[in-house]
Amino acid sequence: QRFAQAQQQLPLESLGWDVAELQLNHTGPQQDPRLYWQGGPALGRSFLHGPELDKGQLRIHRDGIYMVHIQVTLAICSSTTASRHHPTTLAVGICSPASRSISLLRLSFHQGCTIASQRLTPLARGDTLCTNLTGTLLPSRNTDETFFGVQWVRP
Amino acid sequence: QRFAQAQQQLPLESLGWDVAELQLNHTGPQQDPRLYWQGGPALGRSFLHGPELDKGQLRIHRDGIYMVHIQVTLAICSSTTASRHHPTTLAVGICSPASRSISLLRLSFHQGCTIASQRLTPLARGDTLCTNLTGTLLPSRNTDETFFGVQWVRP
Amino acid sequence: QRFAQAQQQLPLESLGWDVAELQLNHTGPQQDPRLYWQGGPALGRSFLHGPELDKGQLRIHRDGIYMVHIQVTLAICSSTTASRHHPTTLAVGICSPASRSISLLRLSFHQGCTIASQRLTPLARGDTLCTNLTGTLLPSRNTDETFFGVQWVRP
């Protein structure tokens, strides 16, 4: 069935197609479990349309419900190293403003070297998302193995 | 950049809700690591609205940012067989045109029998996506265990 | 902010932005493998915009293609317990009406404590989705570890 008559139309901008897909830049110093991200066409296939990066962390620019997704692969990893260095955990959460701090998504690497998941969550303009990786293993910086993104879904 | 001037509006249909969900048809011959996909209502719950299949590989018909997702389950598999036949790896990438060839998403089966992930990536009209499964284990053809899909998200 | 003036554009409702993200309420009694879900802003970050809950199961209100996603983490679980209590399997399917009963997505916990996946599937008004967890281990009720959601994608 046709979606709409030609005369009924939406300005595309007002649909709020905020979207970002980021690649890993680096990990933090010793006591900082956060992953630091980067994005932009010059870097490959990563991009930011709406959200922004603030010191490697993703800041939301538009209120709404978002699909948040992530994949992280550990760099020097096999089933044996994964279990030997086990456990390693990844958590994605709102880290700022402090009043809205909450863990949104949490996964452990159990005998595996990759975690991947996604979820729908309400986010507000100004929310900064942090991805915390605890454990001794380093994440891969390969762009097809480690990535993090958000997609605006509805108001 | 601004998406559109207020007066320039899009008929909703032209927003390009291209979407496809495919089920596994078969694996390739000995030296071909590609998985061959099929889709269509006659086959069950798989479908193609926009993208097309070209010899079992998915071809994109509309430029844009897409959410690509995949799940592959190994057929005759337990934790022990998975580790014994390790490494088994799945990679999703653009395989044609050759000038745009790139790996988009890569996962290994470590002691596990299923991988599942998703990511946002820009795709262009004519891009063909290939899914390469390396290793000796065969993927399950059950439609609730192995599937591959794309969803157009924004221009 | 209002999406659009009524005369020039489509009412938001007609776009069909049906979406839901649920958190685990409880498991069923001994012989019932279903997970029972709950949602609503009073509970935290879960919500239902369009779909409804019917005795803890998600009922669809609008025909269309949906992105279905789920993550389940086992509560009493570490690398060692996961393999000891194997096999534990999660299946998401249409459980009612009976004439449309089908398994949409299936995953096993192999040496791991979390499964996460997503897929595109056509759903019809009145379809009820059930999530069956087989095995002796209980799922975590933490909202960042176990969640289930759907997002309407297109007609």
Epitope: H86, L107 | - | A75, C77
Partner: antibody, heavy 123, light 108 residues
């Protein structure tokens, strides 16, 4: 071998403060949610507070909210309980306990316990 | 908060006896119910989780049943080392676990 060793207990006057510590060894401390559970003399078990593996989430029983603060130093494998405005009813043996799951989340299945440290609040 | 009520608060039994302790939750908690054993002067020990699953290393004479609001711990044949206090605990709440008041099992 997993070991949890509490310290810092003792006699304190009502209104006073005390800081308990729990030194952990034998497991990857940062991956486990940790709790404090107390037991008044001759009484039952009462959960007091918990903190997630990464230290992001903290939880408190209503009876101690606003007076006690739980924290952890994962680099030192140590859990803390800062107890302020102590009352006679806070007198108890305080145990630290680890969650069974290594996801870092609090699931409330306590599989490892310390031997406890006695806190006495009396004038 | 979810209240947990155990009965009886104490019981006397002999070696070889079958012992049953019950625990009732003030609201539905599914199977999110655990049992602990505590011997005098010692820390508690996890016996059963998820209402029915035996914790690692726990003898098979211990068993758990129930779901919803009513739960039971059964010791099929009481052994000398089983004389202790038993606690139920709900793990349904994502913010605060609560224990029952305990059941003391004494030698008759």
């Amino acid at each position: 071998e997993v070991q949890l060793l509490e310290s810092g207990g003792g006699l304190v006057q009502p209104g006073g403060s005390l800081r308990l510590s729990c030194a952990a060894s034998g497991f990857t401390f940062s991956q486990y949610s940790m709790s404090w559970v107390r037991q008044a003399p001759g009484k039952g078990l009462e959960w007091v507070s918990a903190i997630s593996g990464g230290g992001v989430s903290t939880y408190y029983a209503d009876s101690v909210k606003g007076r006690f603060t739980i924290s952890r130093d994962n680099s030192k494998n140590t859990l803390y309980l800062q107890m302020n405005s102590l009352r006679a009813e806070d007198t108890a043996v305080y145990y630290c306990a680890s969650d069974i799951s290594d996801s870092g989340g609090s699931h409330w299945y306590f599989d490892y316990w310390g031997q406890g440290t006695l806190v006495t609040v009396s004038s | 908060d979810i209240q947990m009520t155990q009965s009886p608060s104490s019981l006397s039994a002999s070696v070889g006896d079958r012992v049953t302790i019950t625990c009732r939750a003030s609201q539905y908690i599914g199977r999110y119910l655990n049992w602990y054993q505590q011997k005098r002067g010692k820390a508690p020990k996890l016996l059963i989780h998820g209402a029915t699953s035996l914790a690692s290393g726990v003898p098979s004479r211990f068993s758990g049943s129930g779901s919803g609001t009513d739960f039971t711990l059964t010791i099929s044949s009481l052994q000398p080392e089983d004389f202790a206090t038993y606690y139920c605990q709900q793990s349904y709440s994502t913010t605060s676990p609560t224990f029952g008041q305990g059941t003391k099992v004494e030698i008759k």
